[in-house]
């Protein structure tokens, strides 16, 4: 008795965070024995899509010509060989930005901060939201969530950083979201450049990259410390 079929690999191009209306292609790569590929979306009542393999049969393409909220979510793929269906791939989380109007990101007391001091990044939305995300460009784990407790919605979230070091310097954006789908995000805020002075400067970072590209491993995730966020918002690492 042969063991279970190896799981396929699932990925999205140009990335897994896609602006509303943009196209995205989901790829599932299995083996040369694959006869059919299936894409399942979490909590969907039926397979999301099924495709015949592309020659030489070791992968399939699932095209989304225009990203909408229908497509946002968590996916897995499978392939069928003559002996049955494979194990599921690791999940792919497809996130859509542009679902809500952009929040405003500011730094208190100032985006110019001295090393060793404190700064708070403030993300404010026009309408009440229950999740706020702060993204530092080029961070390995770019998403830090502040999520409202008990579903209470807020107009803002604070991301305190203390003490500030040179690692905190860089370009930030924030997003807001509703709790019923963490795969639907607002438009990104305008970028905020946090400049840390009074410390030895390392090499300048490379040009900023879109949030839809894969983050490089060189930066540590943003870790604000200090006071607990206000307004009943709870910090979550995702």
């Amino acid at each position: 008795q042969a063991g279970p079929l190896p799981k396929p690999t699932l990925w999205a191009e140009p990335g897994s965070v896609i602006s509303w209306g943009n196209s995205v292609t989901i790829w599932c790569q299995g083996t040369l024995e694959a006869r059919e590929y299936r894409l399942d979306k979490e909590e969907s009542p039926a397979p999301w899509d099924r495709q015949n393999p592309l020659e030489p049969k070791n992968k399939a393409r699932f095209s989304i010509p225009s990203m909408t909220e229908d497509y946002a979510g968590r996916y897995r793929c499978y392939y069928r060989s003559p002996v049955g269906w494979s194990q599921p791939s690791d999940p792919l989380e497809l996130v859509m930005t542009g679902a809500y109007s952009k929040p405003t990101l500011s730094a208190l007391p100032s985006p110019l901060v001295t090393s060793g001091k404190s700064v708070t990044l403030l993300c404010q939305s026009r309408s009440p939201m229950d999740t706020f995300l702060l993204i530092k460009e080029r961070a390995a784990h770019p998403l830090l969530h502040l999520r409202s407790e008990h579903g209470a919605q807020q107009h803002q979230a604070e991301f305190p950083m203390s003490p500030v070091t040179s690692v905190h310097g860089g370009t930030y954006r924030c997003f807001s979201s509703h709790g019923f789908s963490h795969y639907l995000l607002s438009h990104p805020s305008d970028p905020l450049e946090l400049i840390v002075s009074g410390s030895l400067e390392g090499p300048r970072p490379s040009p900023t990259r879109s949030v839809s590209t894969a983050a490089g491993p060189e930066d540590q995730p943003l870790m604000p410390t200090g006071s607990v966020p206000h307004s009943g918002l709870r910090r979550h690492w995702e």
């Epitope: 909590e43 039926a46 229908d70």
Partner: antibody
Amino acid sequence: QVQLVESGGGVVQPGRSLRLSCATSGFTFSSYGMHWVRQAPGKGLEWVALIWFDGGNQYYADSVKGRFTISRDNSKNTLYLQLNSLRAEDTAVYFCARDVISMVRGVPFDYWGQGTLVTVSS
Amino acid sequence: DAVVTQESALTTSPGETVTLTCRSSTGAVTTGNYANWVQEKPDHLFTGLIGGIKNRVPGVPARFSGSLIGDRAALTITGAQTEDEAIYFCALWYSNHWVFGGGTKLTVLG
């Protein structure tokens, strides 16, 4: 054209069992998910169960979970519903309905059978 | 358990536009509920109309359209015809099961 024909209904005592069938034609049965839906006399619709195209996933309404089993035989183009431990409140017309090939191809509940009546009575 | 609520009855006239709605007890209807609309005519004749909120079943007249309006799913008949007199059921998906609404009896006064 697409046809769904249910059979197997009848009068049965509480606690007994019954097996319903839904014979299909006019489409590639093995590519589609399938549903059972019921309608009690003078009432609205109640979804009962869903099975995926290959039988790999089944879903049930809480009211029938553990008592009813949905299955299919793709070689015979036939859908089944095994009804065990029947209760008076299971009395209804039972319909099979076609689901989709996939969420991006087709619309659930697009075609329905004419139904088969199950009466649970002592 | 989730409860799906529809208007019990609506009346319209030929040529008028009428909107039927479908509300979920769990909150706003979202794309993840994959709202479906089914028509019942006398003698247990059921026909699917709309799936996935807005996708029309092939062959269903273009006067039938589906959408989300506020926190509800909606079925709009633009230019109702006498043959549209029927009971309309919506169905919503909740992660692992479907739930039908109680149905809306639509009368088209001819």
